[in-house]
């Protein structure tokens, strides 16, 4: 079999709050029941993990309570929210998809989305 | 269905050679990262060594640089692992895993992974 495909937009600019949304979307080669997505940040050959969630088919993602990223699925969709995000934060994200159940097992990994993110200039201080 | 079959593992006295094998089938892409990763028992899995199909280039961890060399036979869809001046260290089970990337992605990077084989057993002892 050929690798899963998995489709997200090249490139998404941060909102002046430091929000960046994309779509993560992937061909299932089969009719998966449990998938795991996960959000990798490569920037300079380097690759971190930002966010992980498992879901069943039909209901919602759950990140972990701390993690910076919210989502929600539809089909073979997932919407992906990441907040708190900062200058220093940009980079290349890439979405890895999992087909975790039932098996056979299949893998695919996005080509990324360059997220540019650019810190507000502060306020000048008012007269008023 | 991707498949990764290993061989070559066993016991070997230290300073001994060992020769790993990895077959793959089932994918058909020709962009792909394949390689070697160890799990000695309480420790987490490590890479080891691995090669990208397309370019060659390899990856090695600081603690087998010099000792072991991995290569790829693309025609046979397998890559080779050979192990030389091998240390207790050493023992662990050794995994073929591979990484559908794409030139974007950064060569042999963990996170990339998923796909993986059985395993082979390989003792390092006197």
């Known amino acids: 079999c050929k690798a899963m495909h998995v489709a997200q937009p090249a490139v998404v600019l941060a909102s002046s709050r430091g929000i960046a949304s994309f779509v993560c979307e992937y061909a299932s080669p089969g009719k998966a029941t449990e998938v795991r997505v996960t959000v990798l940040r490569q920037a300079d050959s380097q690759v971190t993990e930002v966010c992980a969630a498992t879901y069943m088919m039909g209901n919602e993602l759950t990140f972990l309570d701390d993690s910076i990223c919210t989502g929600t699925s539809s089909g073979n969709q997932v919407n992906l929210t990441i907040q708190g995000l900062r200058a220093m934060d940009t980079g290349l994200y890439i979405c890895k998809v999992e087909l975790m159940y039932p098996p056979p097992y299949y893998l695919g990994i996005g080509n990324g989305t360059q997220i540019y993110v650019i810190d507000p200039e502060p306020c000048p201080d008012s007269d008023f | 269905e991707v498949q990764l079959v290993e061989s070559g593992g066993g016991l070997v006295q230290p300073g001994g050679s060992l020769r790993l094998s990895c077959a793959a089938s089932?994918?058909?892409?020709?962009?792909?990262?394949i390689g070697w990763f160890r799990q000695a028992p309480e420790k987490e899995r490590e890479m080891v060594s691995c090669i990208r199909s397309s370019g060659g280039s390899t990856k090695y961890a600081d603690s087998v640089k010099g000792r072991f060399t991995i290569s790829r036979d693309n025609s046979k869809n397998t890559v080779y692992l050979q192990m030389n001046s091998l240390r207790a260290e050493d023992t662990a089970v050794y995994y073929c895993?591979?990484?559908?990337?794409?030139?974007?992605?950064?060569?042999?990077?963990?996170?990339?992974?998923?796909?993986w084989g059985q395993g082979t057993r390989v003792t390092v002892s006197s």
């Open positions: 089932g994918f058909s892409s020709d962009y792909y990262d």
């Open positions: 895993g591979l990484a559908p990337i794409s030139p974007v992605h950064a060569v042999c990077n963990q996170h990339y992974f998923g796909y």
